[in-house]
Interface confidence: medium
């Protein structure tokens, strides 16, 4: 296994309706032709997957129906949007990536990108 | 499905060159390397190398990189082997088969072509 | 380039019993979250057909008779209980690196 240098940016705020986006960079030592993307939730010292795509060069990535992660790749970035953020899920967001195929096998892991979220404030009832 | 047509045999004269193809259908052509294989009469397998379609991108056994050339036409979903200067050591039966998602299966060829029967005499 | 060692070259096989095939490489081809070994299985006139990925992950299709295991530089093939539609030569192939390599071949005989 062969070290690979990702970036991603330190920080990224949430929009009002949970949606935060970011560009995971990475620098491919050869030419892989086999990409897969993870990207992971640090938060108490626990670390869980919070979703991952394998995507084939020049191809969109293509996460499972149910994920709450979409992307689009160009090159060697990685456009990362997760959704349905919540306050709660406030923490640092880790993009892993691997470079699958061929080998030799290349793993870059960034130093993630904290995700502020803030739920927006309920809306006063009003009389009409 | 997923298939891999090959012709079943070519007769060439020592010295001379072939061209074989592989005709892909079934699936993007486009997303799956191709590996060449070879296997003399009664004897084992050998790896050639293989071809990304989407890139261009090939690799080679350094045994074989002066004596096969490997090459695609995506418009035509098919990869090609040229074999040059042949012998009667290159007399085999040469398969091409499509990669698995390296991801999914670690890198095993789960379709295999018929193979193409070479036969180098004069 | 990492040597495939595949034992016995031949072996025979009484109906329903136990085939044990080996194959051991020149350095390890496992990392800590794969063991890239394959194994095919070709019939006379046929192109090699996928039994196992992944040194243990049994291909769509083919019979739970067939197990594979193994780690590091050693692997194994199993077929238990042995069918006579099991005479066949059958390959180990690595993939942990360039040049893919194939064990020399072990021919399993029915009696």
């Known amino acids: 296994c062969k070290a690979m240098h990702v970036a991603q940016p330190a920080v990224v705020l949430a929009s009002s309706r949970g949606i935060a986006s970011f560009v995971c960079e990475y620098a491919s030592p050869g030419k892989a032709t086999e990409v897969r993307v993870t990207v992971l939730r640090q938060a108490d010292s626990q670390v869980t997957e919070v979703c991952a795509a394998t995507y084939m060069m020049g191809n969109e990535l293509t996460f499972l129906d149910d994920s709450i992660c979409t992307g689009t790749s160009s090159g060697n970035q990685v456009n990362l949007t997760i959704q349905g953020l919540r306050a709660m899920d406030t923490g640092l967001y880790i993009c892993k990536v691997e470079l699958m195929y061929p080998p030799p096998y290349y793993l870059g892991i960034g130093n993630g990108t904290q995700i502020y979220v803030i739920d927006p404030e309920p809306c006063p009832d009003s009389d009409f | 499905q997923v298939q891999l047509q090959q012709p079943g045999s070519e007769l060439v004269r020592p010295g001379a060159s072939v061209k074989l193809s592989c005709k892909a259908s079934?699936?993007?052509?486009?997303?799956?390397?191709v590996h060449w294989v070879k296997q003399r009469p009664g004897q084992g397998l050998e790896w050639i190398g293989n071809i990304f379609p989407g890139s261009d991108t090939s690799n080679y056994d350094e045994k074989f990189i002066s004596k096969a050339t490997l090459t695609v036409d995506t418009s035509s979903s098919a990869a090609y082997m040229q074999l040059n200067s042949l012998t009667s050591e290159d007399s085999a039966v040469y398969y091409c088969?499509?990669?698995?998602?390296?991801?999914?299966?670690?890198?095993?060829?789960?379709?295999w072509g018929r193979g193409t029967s070479v036969t180098v005499s004069s | 380039d990492i040597v495939l060692t595949q034992s016995p070259a031949s072996l025979v096989v009484s109906l329903g019993q136990r085939a044990t095939i080996s194959c051991r490489a020149s350095?390890?081809?496992?990392?800590?979250?794969?063991?890239?070994m394959h194994w095919y299985q070709q019939k006379p006139g046929q192109p090699p057909k996928l039994l196992i990925y992944?040194?243990?992950n049994l291909e769509s299709g083919v019979p739970a008779r067939f197990s594979g295991s193994g780690s590091g530089t050693d692997f194994t093939l199993n077929v238990h209980p042995v069918e006579e539609e099991d005479a066949a030569t059958y390959y180990c192939q690595l993939s942990r690196e360039l040049p893919y390599t194939f064990g020399g071949g072990t021919k399993l005989e029915i009696k």
């Open positions: 088969a499509r990669l698995a998602y390296f991801t999914n299966y670690g890198g095993a060829m789960d379709y």
């Open positions: 992944l040194a243990s």
């Open positions: 079934g699936y993007t052509f486009t997303n799956y390397w």
């Open positions: 350095k390890s081809v496992s990392t800590s979250a794969y063991n890239y």
